[in-house]
Structure formats: C-alpha cells, structure tokens
C-alpha cells in the first residue's frame, strides 16, 4: 500500500521517497511527510522560513489530535489557548487569558474571580469564622483579683480565609467590660490570667496543697475567694444569656 | 498519469437514488483519498465525501444522512449514492483524489458529470 | 464547520494587471488552504496547496501566502489564459469547505 502511494506521489512530485524517516508512509526532499502510517498524526513543523511535514504518535503543546478514517493530523488549538483537548475545550490558557469551562477569556463571568497564580476563573471563596469560643475570666491589668470592674474577652477561629473578592473577615476578637465582686489576691498571686492556671513554686513554708491550679479547682480544698469567684462567673453567663451587654470589639 | 472518469444517469426523479461511478486508471484505490465534490449550475464547490484506501469514508454532516460512498476495487472503482433527491441536488459531481496532508489537495479531478433532478 | 469567505466575488483587470484574490476563514486553519482554477465547463485545477506551494507545471506568477485565517492569491501579471473562476479550500479539519469564488473578467 505504501509502495502504490509512493508509486503515485512520484509523479506528481519528483523528489518523492519510499524510502521515508520515522512514521511517515510517503515523504519528499521539499515537502518531507506527505503522508503518515496508520495512528501517527500530519503536523507542520516550522524549519526556519520553511514548513515541512512531520508524523508523529500525539501532537506538540498548542495542538490537538484529530482523527477522520485513515487520516490523521494535528490541529491548531483556538488563537488565545496554549493547551487543548478539542477545538472547543481548552486546558491552559495564554498569557493575559483565564480559563473557565474549557474557555479562554479576557475577563472571568460574573460570580467568578480571576486566580492570578492558576489563571482560571474560580468561585468567589466568602471569609467563614468558627462559633465564639466562651468569655475569658474577668480581668484588669492581667490579673483576676484585687479590683471590681474589668474586662473579659472572648475569641473565634478564622475557618474560611476569603478570596480576593470575597467578604472580608468579621472581628475575631471581641472585648466587654464586666464587674466582679473585688476579692483581695492572695499573698504573691499574680493573677492567673484567663484559663491558664500556671502551676506556680509555692512560697517557704507554703505547701503545694494550698496553691490551686485547674485540678485543684475543682478538688474539696478550695478557699471561699475561689468559691465566690466560681459563683460569679456562673452569675456572668446566665446575665450573658438574658441581655446583650455594650461590646468592644477589636480586629486581629 | 492519473485519470478519473464520472459515469452515471444524466437525470434523476425527485425522492430517487441519485447514483454514480468513478473508474480510476493510472493508480490504484488502494491507496489515497477519494472524494466526491458537487456544483449546481453556476454555483460554488460542495465537498461530499471521501473513502479511504483501506475502504473507510467519511461525508460532509450536512449530507450524511444520504450518502454512501463504497468501492470495487477490483474494478478499481469508487461510487457514490445519494437518496432521496430533489432539485436542489442538481449539479455537475466531480470525484477527486489527494494523498495526505502534505501534498496537493485535489491533485486529480474526473471531468465532471451533470446529473438533473426532475421529473 | 469553517466558513471561508472569498473576495471579491468578480473583478475586471486587464492583460498584465497584478491580482490579488483574498480567502479569510472563520477560524485559524494553520496553512492548509489551497487554491484552485475553474474555467467554463471545466473541472477545476489545482494551483497552490499548503498556502504557497505551487503545484508542478503552475507558472510562478501564481503565489499564495497568509497565516492564520487571512490568506492571499496573487497573480502578479494576468495573462489571457488567467480569466476564470478562481476557488479557495481548506482542508484543516472536516467537513473541508471551498469559498464561494472570483470571477476574474476581462477588462
């Protein structure tokens, strides 16, 4: 078969070689690949001002495969795309282009955002943020005695960090005033900021017993300041519950 | 030199089977493309079809439904068969061959037959 | 399907005029466009495939060239035998479509 269309080609241009490079089933001096063997895919190949056929097993970056019966070529992928699948489904998109649904274009539809690092058209991603996380003990100055009115605190986790065009995160901080009922600090507490007790080394003469840290609350061995603060801090949550007091609040 | 000769019924009736031979001398149908292409009177070229030389064809979609392409290669022909016709199927059927990518397209043409639709 | 649009449609130039025939396809088709001649009665003829290459036997004042989907026949001194119907084809993909033809006529 491939000797009929040498045969053929011959005539029709003088050059023409059975004897042809790599895939291809009839070739010339001027022209190179004719034609190819059966599966390989006819691509022009650029050699300086001139353009000459090749055959190859799958077609270069910036083309497609097509295939017709018993003809094979590479096809050109649209002006703006770099990578396709077909004529109508791009992979990659050039320079200045952003791929959406196999598409290249100027600028991404809206509800979409352009993705500078990817160049697609992607979903505007919203800031989402966890539930408050519960208030901090009231505290003045670092320290959870010695005075009456102070402030508490309480936090929440950013879950969700929003894309460029996507809501802008809500405070996660969130700062109120509050009254305690004044209770002296013992001789050298420092205060034991929020939730973290740390386990301090007790005074001379001081056992261990008697400095409290988190078991320590809740043992039988607690001191009736500590009792008294325990009290008030349920008093805090149910009055938390029952009115919404004036909040502070401050973005980190 | 390659030579290509139409041969067929000079007129068809409406809703018939308009149908058509290409007998090929100088090479062999076993290897190339050929193709079947069509003018109306006065009118620009339409690309029908082909078959290949392994005997695979593939027509224009927009005639699909209606053609059939086949071939004997012992008599080293090629056919064309389009059913149900009417008058805007009136034109000279030229069959035509290529052998790739990289040589002349339609290098050799049959002289063209004029096939009417009419009753 | 690529639509190829021809222009123009007839033009009237004399022995010796340079002519230039335009094809432009509806999308890119990477130089596979090919240009034929049609005189009255006649089979088409084949002049230039690939955008520039001229068929053996296709006197050098026919040219092609173009890229993209612009593409350019030129016939640098008409000669009485040009006058005919000239027909653009691409064959980048299936199904191949023609232009709709220049009539090139005697001034």
């Known amino acids: 078969q491939n000797a009929s269309r040498g045969r053929r080609q011959r005539r029709m241009h003088p050059n023409v070689s059975q004897g042809c490079q790599g895939g291809c089933a009839t070739c010339s001096d001027y022209n190179g690949c004719l034609s190819c063997k059966p599966r390989l895919f006819f691509v022009l190949e650029r050699i300086g001002m001139k353009q000459i056929g090749v055959c190859l097993s799958s077609c270069p970056s910036g083309y497609y495969g097509t295939r017709y019966p018993d003809i094979n070529k590479c096809t050109k992928c649209k002006a703006d795309c770099d990578t396709c699948f077909n004529k109508n489904f791009c992979t990659k998109c050039k320079s200045g282009f952003y791929l959406h649904l196999g598409k290249c274009l100027d600028n991404c539809p809206e509800g979409l955002e352009a993705n500078n690092h990817t160049m697609e058209c992607v979903n505007i991603v919203h800031c989402e943020v966890s539930e408050w996380n519960p208030w901090s003990p009231c505290t003045k100055k670092g320290k959870t005695c010695g005075f009456k009115r102070g402030t508490e605190t309480r936090v929440r986790e950013i879950m969700q960090h929003p894309s460029a065009k996507g809501n802008l995160c809500p405070p996660t901080n969130e700062t109120r005033k509050c009254t305690v009922q004044r209770k002296k600090c013992q001789k050298g507490e420092r205060g034991k900021k929020g939730r973290e007790r740390k386990r301090k080394k007790p005074n001379k003469g001081e056992s261990k017993e008697a400095i409290p840290d988190s078991k320590g609350l809740e043992s039988s061995k607690e001191t009736p300041e500590q009792r008294e603060n325990k009290q008030q801090q349920k008093k805090r949550k149910v009055q938390d519950k029952q009115q919404k007091s004036v909040s502070v609040s401050t973005v980190h | 030199e390659v030579q290509l000769v139409e041969s067929g019924p000079g007129l068809v009736k409406p809703s018939e089977t308009l149908s058509l031979t290409c007998t090929v001398s100088?090479?062999?149908?076993?290897?190339?493309?050929w193709n079947w292409i069509r003018q109306p009177p006065g009118k620009g070229l339409e690309w029908i079809g082909y078959i290949s030389y392994s005997g695979k064809t593939y027509q224009n979609p927009s005639l699909k439904s209606r053609v059939t392409i086949s071939r004997d290669t012992s008599k080293n022909q090629f056919s064309l068969k389009l059913s149900s016709v009417t008058a805007a199927d009136t034109a000279v059927y030229y069959c035509a061959t290529y052998y790739g990518y990289g040589g002349p397209w339609f290098a050799y043409w049959g002289q063209g037959t004029l096939v009417t639709v009419s009753s | 399907d690529i639509q190829m649009t021809q222009s123009p449609s007839s033009l009237s130039a004399s022995v010796g005029d340079r002519v230039t025939i335009t094809c432009k396809a509806s999308q890119d088709i990477d130089s596979y466009l090919s240009w034929f001649q049609q005189k009255p009665g006649k089979a088409p003829k084949t002049l230039i495939y690939l955008t520039n290459r001229l068929v053996d036997g296709v006197p050098s004042r026919f040219s092609g060239s173009g890229s993209g989907t612009d593409y350019t026949l030129t016939i640098s001194s008409l000669q009485p035998e040009d006058f005919a119907t000239y027909y653009c084809?691409?064959?980048?993909?299936?199904?191949?479509?023609f232009g709709q033809g220049t009539k090139v006529e005697i001034k």
């Open positions: 100088g090479d062999s149908i076993t290897s190339g493309y």
């Open positions: 084809l691409h064959y980048d993909e299936f199904p191949l479509t």
